[in-house]
Amino acid sequence: LRRCLISTDMHHIEESFQEIKRAIQAKDTFPNVTILSTLETLQIIKPLDVCCVTKNLLAFYVDRVFKDHQEPNPKILRKISSIANSFLYMQKTLRQCQEQRQCHCRQEATNATRVIHDNYDQLEVHAAAIKSLGELDVFLAWINKNHEVMFSA
């Protein structure tokens, strides 16, 4: 199998993001800088590397972005929390994938992830987290394009 199944409701995640997108992007103080947006690296990922890159980007959001953001308002926090929980569930799915040796990380995949981390590190932590949250739709669109998404009830 070249692709691993992501068994989660992507539509629900996209809805949650759309509800907070404007509020998040309004806080972006570096509109001309991008972390994921113009990533040709994401566009040229080979099918063989999709699982690895997905796994790495989920970890990037869960371990860095969702922990570094400094949003104090419950209205936004509830949505971020909902997205984070969905990402944790997706990580669990991909872990099973790894156990079946279907999520090998080749150098190209590792390089693509490193570019994203490097972009993130070039900004102050709060600014980087806000920007990455604001670019969540780039990652979600990429997942939709590259995975056979099975909607779970």
């Epitope: 509020a23 309004a26 806080k27 400094q70 949003e71 104090p72 419950p74 509830r78 709060h126």
Partner: antibody, heavy 119, light 113 residues
Amino acid sequence: EVQLQQSGPVLVKPGASVKMSCKASGYKFTDYFVGWVKQSHGKSLEWIGYVDPENGYTRCNQKFKGKATLTVDKSSSTAYMELNSLTSEDSAVYYCARYDYDWAWFTNWGQGTLVTVSA
Amino acid sequence: DIVMTQSPSSLAMSVGQKVTMSCKSSQSLLSSYNQKNYLAWYQQKPGQSPKLLVYFASTRPPGVPDRFIGSGSGSDFTLTISSVQAEDLADYFCQQHERLPITFGAGTKLELK
């Protein structure tokens, strides 16, 4: 009527820990974040952190990381804060406060718990 | 962290006088998302817990007398008491909720002459 009832004053020795409670009533406990705020001897207010009673998720001010632990018991609509390795700097009144539903201002406050750290 | 600076630290007024106190933030609290200023004011009477007086810089919650007027935008805010009453003797704190950590000003103590 929304009420936040906090536990009584405590006198503790340096190095000890203390766990204080904040019992909520008059609203659906899981719908509103609970924040904790420190006030040292009549001085200004310091935000310690919040807990989302719905899922127990917490976020603390970096200054209180390793000092404060926030938890909730949904069944009794009670939020807790534990402070460890106490020093005289931790002597203060600690308030729990209910957030607005959407925004991070505090619409209701407990009466405060006075913590005195003394040998 | 966003630093909140209040002035004066104390002031003494007579009943019926107009009072103004200032709160300045080290960064703008105006959100381009909803054009709201993420600033609240609290009143703390002696021996009591703080009480919310104003949110979004100028909106009073139900039950707060209309003599309390919040104004300002960006990083410069003012709380005005149009005609001070004896029961207004208290400390007044401003608070930002634009980003974590939430921070408060050091307070303005209102005393009566």
